[in-house]
């Protein structure tokens, strides 16, 4: 993936389609790589990432990774191709429009990851699957 400040626009000459034949265009994702976070013991959190990037490739989706160890909590936001593993895990939920966190086994830390395929969907990370209603006040974001 190209750096977040390099905005990639859709490539009209190399059309990528999904299983239904719909054109897949590069999506907008939060892209701050790894940042310290205060998100803990909450049903959902905002990324607090101010960088909205256009993903390099049409097939890429938004990803968020939440990690907690004895020292700190971090949140990673990126674009990534779901055909490729990320942190050694397959992105099972890449077609989801929302970023629903799922716990993964990692020694020495608590590790949650989610992926999703709607614009800027990794800005709101959801830890509780019952938490499915959009709260506009919570989800308002500023573009850059």
């Amino acid at each position: 993936t190209i750096p977040p400040h390099v905005q990639k626009s859709v490539n009209n000459d190399m059309i990528v389609t999904d299983n239904n034949g719909a054109v897949k265009f590069p999506q907008l994702c939060k892209f701050c790589d790894v940042r310290f976070s205060t998100c803990d013991n909450q049903k959902s959190c905002m990324s607090n990432c101010s960088i909205t990037s256009i993903c390099e490739k049409p097939q890429e989706v938004c990803v968020a990774v939440w990690r907690k160890n004895d020292e700190n909590i971090t949140l990673e936001t990126v674009c990534h191709d779901p055909k490729l593993p990320y942190h050694d895990f397959i992105l099972e939920d890449a077609a989801s429009p929302k970023c629903i966190m799922k716990e993964k086994k990692k020694p020495g830390e608590t590790f949650f990851m989610c992926s999703c395929s709607s614009d800027e969907c990794n800005d709101n990370i959801i830890f509780s699957e019952e938490y499915n209603t959009s709260n506009p006040d919570l989800l308002l974001v500023i573009f850059q």
Epitope: V6, A22, F25, L140
Partner: antibody
């Protein structure tokens, strides 16, 4: 193939209202931020506003000249974007384009003429 | 809002000429600068994104440069199909504002 087709343009008197529609096809509309951009006759391009996805609350942003008068909405079940224009002024006369926000897909445009 | 100022507003050139259009932002926009080409009666077409990256399918005679507040679009050898109006646009902040345009006409 991505298609964005605007409709609803026409002649309206100052102070009147008009609703533009943009029918989208060929892509996952519900996943995308969408924008409206306008161009007055013989003038440059002017961004009007955007709507984010319903999944992120459907938040909208507007350019200063239309804030409080224009609203943007979307119907993901119909793959359609709307621009509701109220309290229209003569300076709102323009071709209005529907666009996939920050990406290079545009409709053909629809002309709105505000005149008495 | 960030103001985008293009110069010149119009220019006359001949086929084969090297043409340069500049765009200045009222504050730093990093590399969040796009260049569009528009022909009469048509929707704009993206030429350059992120200040210097060529959009797929756009001829290599088009190039962009700059960062911060000053940006340039260069057409190395003007072709008949390049006579059009060119716009810069910043996508650094909302609203994503356009320059006023530069019309490239046949001399």
């Amino acid at each position: 193939q991505v298609q964005l087709v605007e409709s609803g343009g026409g002649l309206v008197e100052p102070g009147g209202s008009l609703r533009l529609s943009c029918a989208a096809s060929g892509f996952q509309f519900s996943n995308a931020w969408m924008s409206w951009v306008r161009q007055a006759p013989g003038k440059g391009l002017e961004w009007v506003g955007r709507i984010k996805t319903t999944y992120s609350g459907g938040a909208t942003d507007f350019a200063a000249p239309v804030k409080g008068r224009f609203t943007i909405s979307r119907d993901d079940s119909k793959n359609t974007l709307y621009l509701q224009m109220n309290s229209l002024k003569t300076e709102d006369t323009a071709v209005y384009y529907c666009t996939l926000d920050l990406r290079d897909y545009w409709g053909q445009g629809t002309l709105v003429t505000v005149s008495s | 809002d960030i103001q985008m100022t293009q110069s010149p507003s119009s220019l006359s050139a001949s086929v084969g000429d090297r043409v340069t259009i500049t765009c200045r932002a009222s504050q730093s926009i990093s590399s969040y600068l796009n260049w569009y080409q528009q022909k009469p009666g048509k929707a704009p077409k993206l030429l350059i994104y992120a200040a210097s990256s060529l959009q797929s399918g756009v001829p290599s005679r088009f190039s962009g440069s700059g960062s911060g507040t000053d940006f340039t679009l260069t057409i190395s050898s003007l072709q008949p199909e390049d006579f059009a109006t060119y716009y810069c646009q910043q996508s650094y902040s909302t609203p994503p504002t356009f320059g006023q345009g530069t019309k490239v006409e046949i001399k």
